[in-house]
């Protein structure tokens, strides 16, 4: 029989009276072979990190600040809980640290030095550690001590809780920095008011403080964000302006053998059985012998984190950046005008090659990582072990809601103005045999599919979002008798054609050999009845022109396409036969790399790009016969995106609204994961 | 296809040098990027030094200042001289002429180079 008893550890004499009494009353109301509770007392948060670690434990609810140490070495430990605060239908299970300031001040975030700073209390989170964090490598040096750092930074501040004494400067507008709410500048709202006040010049706060100290919208409109891309924003913009987004309390286990499903079924019943009045004998949110004693008695329930989500992704970039900064203290020696190495990121091994083959002969300019999947790479992007990679339309949609913007397009028209012209997109065709004469688009059930791979555009996420519209379910393993899907689960029909050994089936990556356009069309070629791809695969794969054995003989007549009315027509007419318009392929990144991304691989491809005549003894950034690698072989420049620098802008309206059409669907664990973040 | 041997390896003591060799033969007319891998037991294949047809030259963070890659183009050879070999250093070393390898997973025999007292 599995032990279903989730070990809580409890940090005081009080917290463990209160799991006793938790064990206990959920004795009284779960089946016997249901999760049960133990109790495991320890002297400090750290000590219970460590106990859990050791399999000691099993759980322990803590703030950010101790997440991150939970998921340092050697603890590697995992959210995998949060509590949420107001309602179960708006629930609120992060807050966001800001930076306010009044509106007609006319500074950005790197023009703060000089200017005076309200704080609400030195080592909280919003006030002190976030932003300073994010400033540390702007301190004047020696950073340690860091008060002093921080008050030669500023001219002046209050720092409630900082020592008066020895850092004057940090107790100016506070006279005697008091730590409790005698100091009227101490906290959230006594931050606010040194604002306010005209004390100082800018407040560190989190974004609910303004809301609750100024309920008139006219009297808000007289104060803005600082963004950290040296921009402002409006205060109700909170989510796209902030310092960071930090989760407010959180259950972590350990990442392997965690019992992390069991940890969720024992919180969702005592939720439903102790939650916010639901019992008078016990109540899981109060503490009548103390103050948020195992969970903090303002929540108001649990949520389940999403089980792709590890503590960086759950920090969030911005937040492991700055804990990290005060934590270890290292700032980079180049000047921070100057632009870092790009870290390209590569899917598996082939890819891999060719980034190695263009770091070389970009001169350090270009570096590589590699991951095996593209929502991989999407997360090596997020928490900053990569910095850029060029996605397919599908992916460019999972990145933007990861918090990631395109930063330039695949042009794939030759014109004279190449990099400041964005083109309007490619279309998304389905592909048969000629000699397949009585196939149509309305008769493809249980017909055998080829796809690029699950959640691109046109080889998955335009036919399927179709198809949807049609079956009303998201069944398409059953729709299709077998095909070959990158990315589907494995046991799954749409794995079947796959021609990947041993793993590597159905991988979404080279590995697989129906994976890709190209891949794709193969299937076609050797085993299936349609194809799912783009308008040019057909051409740039037959007369020739793939020198493949699979391919070399192939002829562009042999091949129709399916129109959505039924009808068929020659490959060349895709303009009057396709199933959608697709955007380009587009690099992404992360909004604070925007720039360098930007400048340098402009540089990159005037070297490396279109203009480069002879492949054959030179490095080529656009080609790999075929195969795609890093960019799409028929891309002819990176262009400028201009306006069009969000996800929303890039993709169309269209098409975000077809592919959120297609989120119930979804087998993303990253697009579930960055909509808990961001729902 | 392009055919690379490479040679050179051998047993050496921490501190001391090696040279390895790789000669290339096949249709070297497209030969452009070279560069050195090296794969140590249970680890990945990682890229060591790099060296384009016009002799510009990038080495892996790890290597700098100790490997020196060069290359012969009248003699379709490339080198590395290897100074100051630490036990991390011990590998496998391939040498690999791009256009060929990330298209058809071409790689040559390697040669063991093994560093201990």
């Known amino acids: 029989v599995p032990d279903k008893t989730v070990r809580w550890c409890a940090v005081s004499e009080h917290e463990a009276t209160k799991c006793q009494s938790f064990r206990d009353h959920m004795k009284s109301v779960i089946p016997s072979d249901g999760p049960s509770v133990a109790c495991v007392k320890k002297a400090s948060y750290l000590d219970c990190i460590r106990a859990i670690a050791a399999n000691e434990a099993d759980a322990v609810t803590l703030d950010a600040g101790l997440v991150y140490d939970a998921y340092l070495a050697p603890n590697n430990l995992k959210p995998v809980v949060a509590e949420f605060y107001g309602s179960k239908e708006d629930p609120q299970t992060f807050y966001y640290a800001v930076a306010v300031v009044k509106k007609d001040s006319g500074f950005q975030m790197n023009q703060l030095r000089g200017k005076k700073s309200c704080h609400t209390g030195l080592g909280r989170s919003a006030g002190w550690n976030i932003p300073i964090g994010l400033l540390y490598c702007d301190l004047p040096e020696p950073r340690k001590p860091l008060e002093k750092a921080v008050a030669n930074f500023f001219s002046g501040s209050c720092a409630p809780c900082a020592d008066g004494t020895d850092f004057p400067q940090l107790c100016q507008l506070c006279p005697g920095c008091g730590c409790s709410t005698l100091n009227q500048y101490f906290g959230y709202s006594g931050a606010f008011k040194c604002l306010k006040d005209g004390a100082g010049d800018v407040a560190f706060v989190k974004h609910s403080t303004i809301f609750e100290n100024l309920a008139n919208k006219a009297d808000r409109d007289q104060y803005e964000l600082l963004c950290l891309d040296n921009t402002r924003k409006p205060v109700d913009e909170y989510k796209d302006c902030h310092l960071a987004q930090v989760p407010s309390h959180t259950v972590v286990a350990r990442s392997m053998g965690g019992k992390e499903d069991l940890i969720w079924e024992l919180l969702n019943q005592a939720q439903e059985h102790f939650g916010k009045d639901k019992s008078k004998e016990f109540q899981l949110f109060s503490s009548p012998h103390g103050k948020d004693l195992l969970f903090k008695d303002s929540a108001h329930g649990f949520l389940k984190v999403p089980p792709r989500m590890d503590a960086k992704m759950y920090l969030g970039y911005e937040y492991v950046t700055a804990i990290r900064n005060l934590r270890e203290g290292t700032c980079p020696e180049a000047p921070t005008d100057e632009c870092k190495p790009v870290k390209w990121c590569a899917l598996s091994h082939h890819e891999r090659l060719k980034c190695d083959e263009w770091s070389v002969n970009s001169v350090g300019k270009i570096e590589c990582v590699s991951a095996e999947t593209t929502e991989d790479c999407i997360a090596k992007i997020m928490n900053g072990e990569a910095d850029a990679m060029s996605l397919d339309g599908g992916f460019v949609y999972i990145a933007g809601k990861c918090g990631l913007v395109p930063v330039l397009a695949e042009n794939y028209n030759k014109s004279d103005n190449c990099e400041d012209t964005p083109e309007a997109g490619y279309f998304a065709i389905a592909v048969v045999k000629k000699s397949a004469s009585d196939l149509t688009w309305d008769n493809l059930k249980g017909k055998k599919s080829c796809h690029t791979a699950v959640g691109r555009t046109a080889g998955w996420n335009i036919p399927m979002g179709l198809l949807y519209n049609k079956i009303n379910h998201c069944r398409f393993d059953e729709f299709f008798s077998e095909g070959c899907a990158p990315g589907s689960k494995k046991d799954s029909s749409l794995c079947k054609l796959c021609m990947g050994s041993g793993l590597n089936l159905c991988e979404p990556n080279n590995k697989e050999g129906y994976y890709g356009y190209t891949g794709a069309f193969r299937c076609l070629v050797e085993k299936g009845d349609v194809a799912f791809v783009k308008h040019q695969t057909v051409p740039q794969n037959t007369g020739g022109k793939n020198p493949d054995p699979w391919a070399k003989n192939l002829n562009e007549k042999d091949y129709e396409l399916l129109c959505l009315d039924g009808t068929r027509k020659p490959v060349e007419e895709y303009a009057n036969c396709h199933l959608a318009r697709a955007p380009n392929h587009a690099v992404v990144t992360r909004k604070d790399k925007e720039a360098c991304v930007h400048k340098i691989l402009r540089q990159q491809q005037h070297l490396f790009g279109s203009n480069v005549t002879d492949c054959s003894g030179n490095f080529c950034l656009f080609r790999s016969e075929t195969k795609d690698l890093l960019f799409r072989d028929d891309t002819v420049c990176l262009a400028k995106l201009h306006d069009r620098n969000t996800y929303e802008k890039y993709l169309g309206e269209e098409y975000v609204k077809a592919v959120g059409n297609l989120r119930k669907c979804s087998t993303s664990s990253l697009l579930e994961a960055c909509t808990f973040r961001r729902p | 296809q392009v055919q690379l041997v490479e040679s050179g390896g051998g047993l050496v003591q921490p501190g001391g040098s090696l040279r390895l060799s790789c000669a290339a033969s096949?249709?070297?007319?497209?030969?452009?990027?070279m560069a050195w891998y090296r794969q140590a037991p249970g680890k990945q294949r990682e890229l060591v030094a790099g060296?384009?047809?016009?002799?510009?030259?990038t080495y892996a963070g790890s290597v700098k200042g100790r490997f020196t890659i060069s290359r012969d183009n009248a003699k379709n050879t490339v080198y590395l001289q290897m100074n100051s070999l630490k036990p991390e250093d011990t590998a496998v070393y391939y040498c690999?002429?791009?256009?060929?390898?990330?298209?058809?997973?071409?790689w040559g025999q390697g040669t063991q180079v093994t560093v201990s007292s």
């Open positions: 096949g249709s070297i007319f497209s030969i452009n990027t």
């Open positions: 690999t002429d791009y256009s060929s390898s990330y298209y058809q997973d071409y």
């Open positions: 060296i384009t047809r016009s002799g510009t030259t």
